[in-house]
């Protein structure tokens, strides 16, 4: 009985199409597959960012695979050929590993890259990213932001930079069509006449960095002698009601009565006959049904109800913001 052997895939490489971290891993079939013409050869691919403890593992019949990586670090990958047991009289045969690596040659010292990168997707409509210049960089240093997500033909540069002392310190993005629930890749690179500037790469999903507008149209309704219903409306914009969680802060006669988190645009409050004044504010956040994370909105304007008797339904609006 001769031992069945199979070669590893050929021409295994990591290709950077310029998508700021979304890379192609590709290969060619192994040599000498003539003996296994009736067989469907599979490939086991393992890859990770250098420094990561765990490998991602994929088994595929294809000759390519695509995924996102952190280009601030190198990437390593290995692949071998698998012959299923159907082809080899009952035992799976594996080739040796073919290995490859990829990294972007870093320019400049790490301190020159942008600091404190912060991106917020306001009301699921407007993306704004801001950063601080690298440590010790001169005023002749300028940073440029590029972004890509699946659906764009190529990486795009920021349309509207925010500047400070002539330096770009932020970006207001244009309309981003069909850009949520997928990885959003950003590169901020820089140029200076004096020294090379280190690039920075960032990846996130837009739905996870949404900061909604605060709720509006806060009202009170007397439900019974000891119950008051607080109501509000979702803010204008594209976020549907099903995506909101709310936090309410209620003050009764200048003392905090309750803080509550609710899923609907109402909250029923038990009151006493002695209550002279009732005020509440509410803020919103995208909930777990629509995102993995989010940012609380600002508090709404304060809504107060006061008078000798709350049942008189005297409504007073206070238009200063709650702090």
């Amino acid at each position: 009985d001769t031992e069945i052997k199979v070669n590893p895939p050929q021409d295994f490489e990591i290709v950077d199409p310029g998508y700021l971290g979304y890379l192609y891993l590709q290969w060619q079939p192994p040599l000498s597959l003539d003996h296994f013409k009736e067989c469907t050869v599979e490939y086991e691919l393992k890859y990770r960012n250098i420094g990561s403890e765990t490998w991602k593992t994929i088994i595929t019949k294809n000759l390519h695979y695509k995924d996102g990586f952190d280009l601030n670090k190198g990437i390593e990958a290995k692949i071998h050929t698998l012959l299923p047991w159907q082809c080899t009289n009952g035992s799976e045969v594996q080739s040796s590993w073919a290995e490859t690596t990829y990294w972007i040659s870093p320019q400049g010292i790490p301190e020159t890259k942008v600091q404190d990168m912060d991106c917020v997707y306001y009301n699921w409509q407007y993306l704004l990213c801001s950063w601080k210049p690298g440590i010790g960089v001169l005023l002749d240093t300028n940073y440029n932001l590029f972004y890509w997500y699946e659906g764009l033909d190529h990486a795009l540069q920021c349309v509207d930079y925010i500047k400070a002392d002539g330096q770009n310190i932020g970006c207001r993005f244009p309309y981003l069509e069909a850009s949520d629930y997928k990885d959003f890749y950003i590169c901020v690179n820089g140029s200076s006449e004096n020294k090379p500037i280190r690039s920075s790469y960032f990846t996130f999903q837009l739905q996870n960095i949404v900061k909604p507008l605060p709720p509006v149209y806060l009202t009170f309704t007397r439900e019974s002698s000891c119950e008051i219903k607080l109501k509000w409306s979702i803010p204008l914009g594209p976020i549907p009601a099903r995506c909101f969680d709310y936090e309410i802060e209620i003050r009764e006669d200048d003392t905090t009565l309750v803080t509550a988190t609710v899923e609907n645009e109402t909250y029923t409050l038990k009151t006493t006959n002695e209550t002279r004044q009732l005020c509440f504010v509410v803020r919103s956040k995208v909930n777990i049904y629509c995102s993995d994370d989010g940012i609380w909105s600002e508090w709404s304007d304060k809504q107060c109800w006061e008078g000798e008797d709350l049942s008189k339904k005297t409504l007073l609006r206070h238009h200063h913001h709650h702090h």
Epitope: Q125, Y126, D153, V159, D160, I162, K163, P174, Y175
Partner: antibody, heavy 119, light 111 residues
């Protein structure tokens, strides 16, 4: 909820200056560009300039650059447009108008401030 | 500066009809894969109201009967079925480069 409230009507003599204010509420003032646009009686719209409240960066229409000054007070969420050396052809309604970056147009406008220049 | 020319200057139509307004730029207003062309509606004594931005995207709260199209130098605002409240003046505006400029306007009047 977004509101841009402008200062009241002004009547000025030729050669004088006028300063129009625009108080913003209902949104984060520094996140949006603030534009100034004017409209002479029965005429079209003319862009004067804009300020980025985030960093104070300003772009002016060169037709006005020697006479106009746009400023902002972020703590008061207010933008200002001052026009000097007034002449009769500066008689117009002056609008402040908010826009998120150049790709979004101008989505909220103030109510307008009428400036009349007459001797 | 980029000059915008709107046509016709006046358009007389009846409610229920389709309106097609044109705006031509003296040079392309495209950049970064975006057409920096916006459309506004203005009624007497009121501030303008944003209808369309980036050539074809509807402003917030704008009825579906308003649509925009075009790229480069030629742009169109279409109102599919005119409602009585649609009779007003319409301006195009480019935001590709400073100074931002407006077209001279098209007055849409009741026939």
């Amino acid at each position: 909820q977004v509101q841009l409230v402008q200062s009241g009507a002004e009547v000025k003599k030729p050669g004088a200056s006028v300063k129009v204010s625009c108080k913003a509420s209902g949104y984060t003032f520094s996140n949006y560009l603030m534009n100034w646009v004017r409209q002479a009686p029965g005429q079209g719209l003319e862009w004067i300039g804009r300020i980025d409240p985030y960093d104070g960066d300003i772009d002016y229409n060169q037709n006005f650059k020697d006479r106009v000054t746009i400023t902002r007070d972020t703590s008061a969420s207010t933008a200002y447009m001052e026009l000097s050396s007034l002449r009769s052809e500066d008689t117009a309604v002056y609008y402040c108008a908010r826009g998120y970056g150049t790709a979004y147009g101008v989505d909220y406008w103030g109510q307008g401030t009428s400036v009349t220049v007459s001797s | 500066e980029i000059v915008l020319t709107q046509s016709p200057a006046t358009l007389s139509l009846s409610p229920g009809e389709r309106a097609t307004l044109s705006c031509r730029a003296s040079e392309s207003v495209d950049n970064y894969g975006i057409s920096f062309m916006n459309w506004y509606q203005q009624k007497p004594g009121q501030a303008p109201r944003l209808l369309i931005y980036a050539a074809s995207r509807q402003g917030s709260g704008i009825p579906d009967r308003f649509s925009g199209s075009g790229s480069g130098t030629d742009f169109t605002l279409t109102i599919s079925r005119l409602e009585p409240e649609d009779f007003a003046v319409y301006f195009c505006q480019q935001s590709k480069e400073v100074p931002w400029t407006f077209g001279g306007g098209t007055k849409l009047e009741i026939k």
